[in-house]
Amino acid sequence: MRTEAQVPALQPPEPGLEGAMGHRTLVLPWVLLTLCVTAGTPEVWVQVRMEATELSSFTIRCGFLGSGSISLVTVSWGGPNGAGGTTLAVLHPERGIRQWAPARQARWETQSSISLILEGSGASSPCANTTFCCKFASFPEGSWEACGSLPPSSDPGLSAPPTPAPILRADLAGILGVSGVLLFGCVYLLHLLRRHKHRPAPRLQPSRTSPQAPRARAWAPSQASQAALHVPYATINTSCRPATLDTAHPHGGPSWWASLPTHAAHRPQGPAAWASTPIPARGSFVSVENGLYAQAGERPPHTGPGLTLFPDPRGPRAMEGPLGVR
């Protein structure tokens, strides 16, 4: 799924020349260099459809295109997650899936896309102008969220022209947090390289077990910061609010996974084709600051609400992701 980056293995320096500390400072630049080179800007997409068979049943599909590895997906409705939205489902690549009414079936379609079917009846059922949002937490990009609504005509097999204003945002977690670290790392890397300029260069040799790494062009966090300051994302006011499910929100940390049966479908159940794509293992937790970086959604002419910038009220959030890359 990802392209590979050949990271050269460093030949250890001669004993006594640099010592263990020197070796560590030589390895670190290569790790930083890999991260500097591989940071990209993910694309997140959302698709909302009404089922032909059950007109009050919705299917939400979301996908993530990026170089990092997905550590968590949160699907919400009624607005962005953390800005008035209510969590419908949380999908973790290893720990499985949790969902709350009216979500009927959440599943991984592929390693980078998910789908969620919503029950159509009852007080908490969605209506046509409900906003659905998908938030992907990934390493090293951070958290990225996109939102969408049902298109005006949503018969399967036909797509209508757009009227809903889409929402696309990314948490500063991924921009000022991780990217800030990367920027600092890149500066530090340059500093180290300058320091090592007058020393004998280590011999490089191709690694026989080169780790896989994504390859997307790095981009300047400062650009993102500027965008964050100037570009709010569009919000869609919905007259149809979901039933209050706030008690179901998994804000208490990862412990809520404990109640999840081990068989709870973190591998897609069903078509055999899905069984052949196991989700890779993930590493340890990376804690990041959860500010908000907003990207503008398109606002249809003469329609829709004003543009509003929501801060995320929940403060810092733990985000799981590997310290290495897939």
């Epitope: 592929t110 969408g148 097999g157 503008a296 959604g297």
Partner: antibody, heavy 120, light 107 residues
Framework: QVQLQQPGTELVKPGASVKLSCKAS????????MHWVRQRPGQGLEWIGN????????NYNEKFKTKATLTVDRSSSTAYMHLSSLTSEDSAVYYC?????????????WGQGTTLTVSS | DIVMTQSQKFMSTSVGDRVSVTCKAS??????VAWYQQKPGQSPKLLIY???YRYSGVPDRFTGSGSGTDFTLTISNVQSEDLADYFC?????????FGGGTKLEIK
């Protein structure tokens, strides 16, 4: 209406570089990912990369990473692709395309393409 | 990279016939597939996305199906204006990749 305007042809010499343009109109340029696709004569389509005009964030196909550089000018709603160290292998039609941002993922509008000829 | 294979480079059919263009992905892409039509001298045009959703304005004789690794674009009641190249494309992961194309020829 939505339009992506590209120059019809570019003729350059081997070893030179060129900057292809794609002027967008009829929609909010900053909120749509812009993609670039190459098509060699009689061949299929190859994805080069994409750029998000709002912040300049981009992704590249590894194959084109040293060949292409994507940029945008928000003030003129124009996406650019700079191609360097050109050889006859780079002769092709280069398309820019807009990715829909409200309903799944697809290219709903394409430019007419710029035919790049690299010849001495 | 995910390889999208369109095994039939050329297909010949007659007006009024039904024809199926196939596309196989090298790994599971779910339903993250689009189909484009490219007429001679023109840029590609979207026909189908999400494997089976017909884009606005596309005639209903074009239908898409499949999921996982195998996808089909079916054109029923083929018209002379359907003479074109047809490309599948996956958008499950970067780099985005296209099939090699199938040229539909009208007898």
């Amino acid at each position: 209406q939505v339009q992506l305007q590209q120059p019809g042809t570019e003729l350059v010499k081997p070893g030179a570089s060129v900057k292809l343009s794609c002027k967008a109109s009829g929609f909010t340029f900053t909120t749509h990912w812009m993609h670039w696709v190459r098509q060699r004569p009689g061949q299929g389509l190859e994805w080069i990369g994409n750029i998000y005009p709002s912040n300049g964030g981009s992704n590249y196909n590894e194959k084109f990473k040293t060949k292409a550089t994507l940029t945008v000018d928000r003030s003129s709603s124009t996406a650019y692709m700079h191609l360097s160290s050109l050889t006859s292998e780079d002769s092709a039609v280069y398309y820019c395309a807009r990715r829909v941002n409200w309903d799944g993922y697809y290219f709903d509008y394409w430019g007419q393409g710029t035919t790049l000829t690299v010849s001495s | 990279d995910i390889v999208m294979t369109q095994s039939q480079k050329f297909m010949s059919t007659s007006v009024g016939d039904r024809v199926s263009v196939t596309c196989k992905a090298s790994q599971n892409v779910g339903t993250n597939v689009a189909w484009y039509q490219q007429k001679p001298g023109q840029s590609p045009k979207l026909l189908i996305y999400s494997a089976s959703y017909r884009y606005s304005g596309v005639p209903d004789r074009f239908t898409g199906s499949g999921s996982g690794t195998d996808f089909t674009l079916t054109i029923s009641n083929v018209q002379s204006e359907d003479l074109a190249d047809y490309f599948c494309q996956q958008y499950n992961s970067y780099p985005l990749t296209f099939g090699g194309g199938t040229k539909l020829e009208i007898k």
